[in-house]
Interface confidence: low
């Protein structure tokens, strides 16, 4: 089999054997090595010498195989924009940010650049659960039958109605989507507004 060419090697068709790890250098019409993640080009290749790479300095990075002569500057997650850090910058990747709790991504440009407060869900509703936290604003859905939620909140969940009989009590007023069941002692008189109604 044909011996594998080692960079730098001539390329007449302007393409290189390994597109990820090599690049075409048009001045000399040769293929040269890219620098691996976490490094940059400290000396460009020539016909007789391959690319020389150096490690990115602290607080800078290059994520991919590259022929960049500098490393990208690490940027902190901007708390003013509602972002928080989940993993620090390394020489091989940028700082990993996400929206702070209670916020969602309102502006996206390859990554989230701006977060805003989640909308409140009114009583009787809850936020629909999302696959990924912080990806979108709340979509409020009604509490399902037998459940209630009595606050305006971005995160409160609908809770099941209290079952009076489980506590040895009887129902004085049924639960709604916005309020829990009202229970009373079986021996207590009915509240005035319910007199004449027989509790089963």
């Amino acid at each position: 089999s044909q011996p594998q060419a080692v960079p730098p090697y001539a390329s007449e068709n302007q393409t290189c054997r390994d597109q990820e790890k090599e690049y075409y250098e048009p001045q000399h019409r040769i293929c040269c090595s890219r620098c691996p993640p976490g490094t940059y080009v400290s000396a460009k290749c020539s016909r007789i010498r391959d690319t020389v790479c150096a490690t990115c300095a602290e607080n800078s990075y290059n994520e991919h195989w590259n022929y960049l002569t500098i490393c990208q500057l690490c940027r902190p997650c901007d708390p003013v924009m509602g972002l928080e850090e989940i993993a620090p910058c390394t020489s091989k990747r940028k700082t990993q940010c996400r929206c702070q709790p209670g916020m969602f991504c309102a502006a996206w440009a390859l990554e989230c650049t701006h977060c805003e407060l989640l909308s409140d869900c009114p009583p009787g509703t809850e936020a629909e659960l999302k696959d990924e936290v912080g990806k979108g604003n709340n979509h409020c859905v009604p509490c399902k039958a037998g459940h209630f939620q009595n606050t305006s909140s971005p995160s409160a969940r609908c809770q099941p109605h209290t079952r009076c009989e489980n506590q040895g009590l009887v129902e004085a007023a049924p639960g709604t989507a916005q309020s829990d069941t009202t229970c009373k002692n079986p021996l207590e008189p009915l509240p005035p507004e319910m007199s004449g109604t027989m509790l089963m």
Epitope: E20, G38, E58, E63, A87, T90, S91, K92, R93
Partner: antibody, heavy 121, light 107 residues
């Protein structure tokens, strides 16, 4: 030659404490993040904790959070792991490792030989 | 936390064989993946970082590929010194986690 040498392992009762040390040589210690990784008998590797080069940032696995504390003394070229409220499941060989990315870590390119911690009554 | 799943958990192979080990992440980790080799009673050794970058001093028969959730470690021609356990490890976000390991045994 870059070297890491762990010490401080031993037998300890459940609920007890132990402090592991890792002495570093052959590189500028304060320029590099450091990591502790452990391996229970017959099991795989478990990432435990990491500390930045300056010591200003620390990270922990959920299984040790609140019980273990990673720290470093750059003047002594030494990394530490203070282990409190030890449990049987903390029994393992503990390795310290140097992160090749400088003062922030992600890739462990040099490892110590490990020190054994046994938690048993 | 991100879970890393390796397959197979063990395999038997002969000298000269081409060996492929796969690692799957429970969510997208881009190329934030390392591969380590560990021999019995020894500390792990870094082979591949950033999914496909060969660590200095590691023989070129080792190669890594993949991005997103699916990754592969390939040994193009297995040598006697390659019988060991191999681990993948992500560094997308804390806590970093390892795969459960793949033991490569002699057939």
């Amino acid at each position: 030659e870059v070297q890491l040498l762990e010490s401080g392992g031993g037998l300890v009762q459940p609920g007890g404490s132990l402090r592991l040390s890792c002495a570093a040589s052959g590189f500028t210690f304060s320029n590099y993040a450091m990591t502790w990784v452990r391996q229970a008998p017959g099991k795989g590797l478990e990432w435990v904790s990491e500390i930045s080069g300056s010591g200003g940032s620390t990270y922990y696995a959920d299984s040790v959070k609140g019980r273990f504390t990673i720290s470093r003394d750059n003047s002594k070229n030494t990394l530490y792991l203070q282990m409190n409220s030890l449990r049987a499941e903390d029994t393992a060989v503990y390795y310290c490792a140097k992160d090749d990315d400088g003062a922030y870590g992600d890739t462990m390119d040099v490892w110590g030989q490990g020190t054994t911690v046994t938690v048993s009554s | 936390d991100i879970q890393m799943t390796q397959s197979p958990s063990s395999l038997s192979a002969s000298i000269g064989d081409r060996v492929t080990i796969t690692c799957r992440a429970s969510q997208d980790i881009s190329n934030y993946l390392n591969w380590y080799q560990q021999k019995p009673g020894k500390a792990p050794k870094l082979l591949i970082y950033a999914a496909s970058a060969l660590q200095s001093g590691v023989p070129s028969r080792f190669s890594g590929s993949g991005s997103g959730t699916d990754f592969t470690l390939t040994i193009s021609s297995l040598q006697p010194e390659d019988f060991a356990t191999y681990y993948c490890q992500h560094y997308k976000s804390y806590p970093y986690t390892f795969g459960q390991g793949t033991k490569v045994e002699i057939r």
